[in-house]
């Protein structure tokens, strides 16, 4: 998970291959960074892991550095946006992506205030692109369900991010396993529900078919 203090274009492209991107305002040319309590627009050239985002399960938008999801507060929807636990029930964590716009319920969309904080507003001004991708639409990185194999949830898709060992995982992990197989939880909290499955690993050649797949009798 180590991310260099400043992400090189090559490093950015590697992240984009994994569905991880930096959100840049098309008009202001600045990028969204997650701070302790608010999101702000900052110089994209100082990109760091708090500028890295990934579309996750249930239309969530996960910040890699802050290990939280973008949330719209039920109690004060037009306050500056911030990160929340990805299974919080006090906020709306779902965002729709369409034509470079990030929209939530009641037609709130992700916008920028005069002080460069990121807010939800019904004024549709800001369009968002993926920094370092030649103006690519962040909607291109939308989450696709990854269905599990074996485990105990009958092929249910991975829930990303999921919390295991006090850490939020936005991709399959080998942590906690001695056999080096990739796995994920199929609910947001592994320790609470213990629902899990193996992840299909197209890169792993040494794992035999019968390790994961059930044989026809």
């Amino acid at each position: 998970e180590g991310v260099a203090a400043a992400l090189t274009p090559e490093r950015l492209l590697e992240w984009q291959d994994k569905g991880i991107f930096v959100i840049q305002s098309e008009s202001l040319k600045k990028c969204i960074q997650a701070g302790k309590s608010v999101l702000t627009l900052e110089n994209c050239k100082q990109a760091n892991k708090h500028m890295l985002w990934k579309w996750v399960s249930n239309h969530g938008l996960f910040n890699i550095g802050g290990s939280g999801c973008l949330g719209l507060n039920f109690s004060a929807p037009e306050q500056p946006l911030s990160l929340y636990e990805c299974d919080s029930t006090l906020v709306s964590l779902r965002w729709r992506c369409n034509r470079k716009m990030i929209t939530g319920p009641l037609q709130y969309s992700v916008q920028v205030a005069h002080d460069n904080t990121v807010v939800a507003s019904r004024k549709y001004i800001h369009k968002w692109i993926s920094y370092g991708s030649g103006g690519g639409d962040i909607c291109e990185y939308l989450h696709k369900d990854l269905h599990t194999i074996k485990g105990n949830t009958h092929g249910m898709p991975c829930m990303f991010p999921f919390q295991y060992n006090h850490q939020w995982h936005h991709e399959c992990t080998r942590e906690g396993r001695e056999d080096d197989l990739l796995w994920c939880a199929t609910t947001s909290r592994y320790e609470r529900d213990e629902k899990w499955g193996f992840c299909p690993d197209p890169t792993s050649a040494e794992v035999g078919c019968d390790t994961i797949w059930e044989k026809d009798l």
Epitope: H59, F74, S75, A76, P77, L90, R94, P105, L106, Q107
Partner: antibody
């Protein structure tokens, strides 16, 4: 246990006023957007008004705009609906509910009857 | 305002049946839709939000689907306590609107 309980309903004449209250318990009240929704006899549910946790964002259905006022007292975990210029078609069971977008918790309701 | 139209208005079914209720919006509401159940003398309760997410504590026989303008609520195997009135509600716009309801009655 999380609970919402409405009060203040009753019989009122057309043109009259009424103030409904909703007492909340078991939740951090200031963190929740709150709403009034009504169910008129023989009709479907109708959203009436919403208020955000800090009272900065308030919205009303067109049918009650200018006649009803939603407010809240976070210190006392209370929600209010001040209704004036009441009409016969305001007759309904009025429910207090939490949630800013959809309504995830409801009180049992209080009946408002507008009749001469 | 966005109009929400539910069909059928009344549906007669038996315990154990699989039933599907539909809700149509007059314009696209993305997935900002909730389903509620109301039984006589009780307050409504939310079953599904954001078109397909099951509210905590709601039995898994309830499921929702759809996006844009067309939505469905499916009950996979009707139980006696499921009979009542079902409402859909959009929260795409500030003026949140409900459908007129579908009455689910015992055949």
């Amino acid at each position: 246990e999380v609970q919402l309980l409405e009060s203040g309903g009753g019989l009122v004449k057309p043109g009259g006023s009424l103030r409904l209250s909703c007492a909340a318990s078991g939740l951090i009240f200031k963190n929740y957007g709150m709403n009034w929704v009504r169910l008129a006899p023989g009709k479907g549910l109708e959203w009436v008004a919403s208020i955000s946790g800090n009272s900065n964002y308030i919205s009303y259905a067109d049918s009650v705009k200018g006649r009803f006022t939603i407010s809240r007292d976070n210190a006392n975990n209370s929600l209010f609906l001040q209704m004036s210029s009441l009409r016969a078609d305001d007759t309904a069971v009025y429910y207090c509910s939490s949630g800013y977008f959809y309504f995830d918790l409801w009180g049992p309701g209080t009946l408002v009857t507008v009749s001469s | 305002d966005i109009q929400m139209t539910q069909s059928p208005s009344i549906l007669s079914a038996s315990v154990g049946d699989r039933v599907t209720l539909t809700c149509r919006a007059s314009q696209s509401i993305s997935s900002w839709l909730a389903w509620y159940q109301q039984t006589p003398g009780k307050a409504p309760r939310v079953l599904i939000y954001e078109a397909s997410t099951l509210e905590v504590g709601v039995p898994s026989r309830f499921s929702g689907s759809g996006s844009g303008t067309d939505f469905t609520l499916t009950i996979s195997s009707l139980q006696p306590e499921d009979f009542g009135t079902y409402f859909c509600q959009q929260y795409h716009t500030d003026s949140r609107t409900f459908g007129q309801g579908t009455i689910l009655e015992i055949k």
